[in-house]
């Protein structure tokens, strides 16, 4: 997290919002359920208290505007900026305003007004953008879905540096972003994507360049919006430009970053038994066209060139792959080597010998 | 999918002009955000200026505000850098770059930036 130079916070804990106007996109109870959601956000957490009120001056003056709107702060028109706040202060000091050229909603069409609202408080408060990409105060919109939102641990750390802890914190559960180097790291899936290598746990994904040893976290719906948070398994088809993505029954085919018509579809579809609920890795050779997909104890291969299920599967992992255990989290080949992912540890396997090179800590392949 | 091709870098000397060109292709680019970058041999690759495709809004890093001007032709889908008074200390390999995420209340400076041009080199010298 970040605070604002000189650590410019509220020198009361209770303090006043007003909505000076409204977006048409939202009905005006819409607008104010979204901003009263978004300063609860922080109240939960904080000694902090926000009262509505109708009319004169409160400590943040809440407003929509299109371009110049008075501030010497023009807006853009539709996408590029969203809004902007102010951080605590007198006059303009913790004011959040709208861009009204945006359409506002509070569902995941347009732009969700409590996300960004929510957002923009954090910097009425006193918070700057974070470099934590799991962060409610890094500076990309992701609207991360229906569910009920939780707020990502560096962001409850930063508001509590300036403002200390809450009485009681109704949601204590504050999701906190992977750390890379963390040695009981376990991986959900990982996959090539044109020479890159996408590593996904939690709701993000590294992203490593073939020369670079510093991989870039993302949220995964940074990227496409559409995938759910987590996923279960990734294979890349580099012949056809494509990334499958599984997630418990369904599968989803990637063109970069988009969705191919008729996905996601089931599972089931590729062949697999009703029973299977989800695959825990799968990996793609480009040479013989065939994909090996990992479920429980049990591994299947598919043809992808003649879209069937190779017979004589599924067959046991032990079996077919001795000393890796059991069970596979994460898999990816590479020159002529598998890597088998199980927990915090990984195993290099020599297709041509067919046994165990080395092992490996899972986080190694992220330059740890 | 996106492709960016850089032009119009040379040797100019110090005080002199240039402009270039970063013509892009492959899909539309209504909600993009377009930025110039460069890299200097040794050094960090390091924002420039940015537009934002839609409305036509730019944003400068400070050591080139008031010298160089973004700007974008939607017909031709292509961005352009306007440098002048250039020093040589713009010496650099400039590239285009689009970001197709949104962001909040801040133009992104360097990382996540999704496409990346192949970039063309600049070379301010007497």
């Known amino acids: 997290y970040n605070v604002f130079p000189r650590t410019l916070k509220w020198s009361k804990m209770n303090l006043t919002y007003r909505i000076v106007n409204y977006t048409p996109d939202m009905t005006h109870s819409e607008v104010e359920k979204a901003f009263k959601k978004a300063f609860k956000v922080w109240s939960d957490v904080t000694p902090l208290n926000f009262t509505r009120l109708h009319d004169g001056i409160a400590d943040i003056m809440i407003s929509f505007g299109i371009k110049e709107h008075g501030d010497f702060y023009p807006f853009d028109g539709p996408s590029g900026l969203l809004a902007h706040a102010f951080p605590p202060g007198p006059n303009y000091g913790g004011d959040a305003h709208f861009d009204d050229d945006e359409t506002w909603t509070s569902s995941s069409k347009g732009y969700n007004l409590f996300l960004v609202a929510a957002h923009e408080f954090g910097h009425s408060l006193g918070l700057d953008h974070s470099k934590d990409p799991g962060a409610l105060m890094f500076p990309i919109y992701t609207y991360t879905g229906k569910s009920h939102f939780m707020l990502p641990d560096d962001d409850v750390q930063g508001i509590q540096s300036l403002y200390g802890p809450g009485d009681e914190d109704p949601n204590p559960k504050h999701p906190k972003t992977p750390d890379k180097c963390d040695p009981s790291l376990s991986l959900d899936a990982i996959t090539s994507l044109r020479g890159e290598t996408m590593i996904f746990k939690d709701r993000f994904f590294w992203r490593l360049h073939p020369q670079q040893v510093d991989a870039e976290l993302f949220l995964t719906k940074s990227f496409w919006p559409e995938l759910p948070n987590r996923i279960d398994a990734a294979y890349e088809h580099p012949s056809h430009d494509l990334i499958f993505i599984f997630r418990g029954r369904k599968f989803w085919a990637l063109n970069g970053y988009d969705i191919l018509e008729g996905y996601p579809k089931k599972i089931s579809e590729l062949g697999l038994p009703k029973e299977v609920k989800k695959i825990s890795a799968a990996v793609h050779f480009e040479d013989t066209g065939k994909t090996l997909l990992f479920s429980g104890n049990q591994v299947w291969r598919y043809d992808d060139t003649n879209h069937i299920m190779d017979k004589d599967y599924p067959r046991l992992i032990e079996e077919d792959f001795p000393g890796i255990g059991d069970k596979v989290d994460a898999v990816y080949e590479k020159n002529g080597y598998i890597y088998f992912f199980n927990g915090p540890i990984q195993f290099e396997y020599s297709i041509w010998s067919n046994r165990i090179v080395r092992v490996m800590p899972a986080n190694s392949i992220l330059w740890c | 999918d996106v492709q960016l091709v850089e032009s119009g870098g040379g040797l100019v000397q110090p005080g002199g002009s240039l402009r270039l060109s970063c013509a892009a292709s492959?899909?539309?680019?209504?909600?993009?955000?377009m930025g110039w970058f460069r890299q200097a041999p040794g050094k960090e690759r390091e924002f420039v200026a940015a537009?934002?495709?839609?409305?036509?809004?730019?944003y400068y890093a400070d050591s080139v505000k008031g010298r160089f001007t973004i700007s974008r032709d939607n017909s031709k889908n292509t961005v352009y850098l306007q440098m002048n008074s250039l020093r040589p200390e713009d010496t650099a390999v400039y590239y285009c770059?689009?970001?197709?995420?949104?962001?909040?209340?801040?133009?992104?400076?360097?990382?996540?930036?999704?496409?990346w041009g192949q970039g063309t080199l600049v070379t301010v010298s007497s």
């Open positions: 770059a689009a970001d197709r995420r949104v962001y909040y209340d801040t133009y992104p400076n360097l990382r996540g930036y999704d496409y």
């Open positions: 492959g899909r539309t680019f209504s909600r993009y955000v």
């Open positions: 537009i934002n495709w839609s409305s036509g809004s730019t």
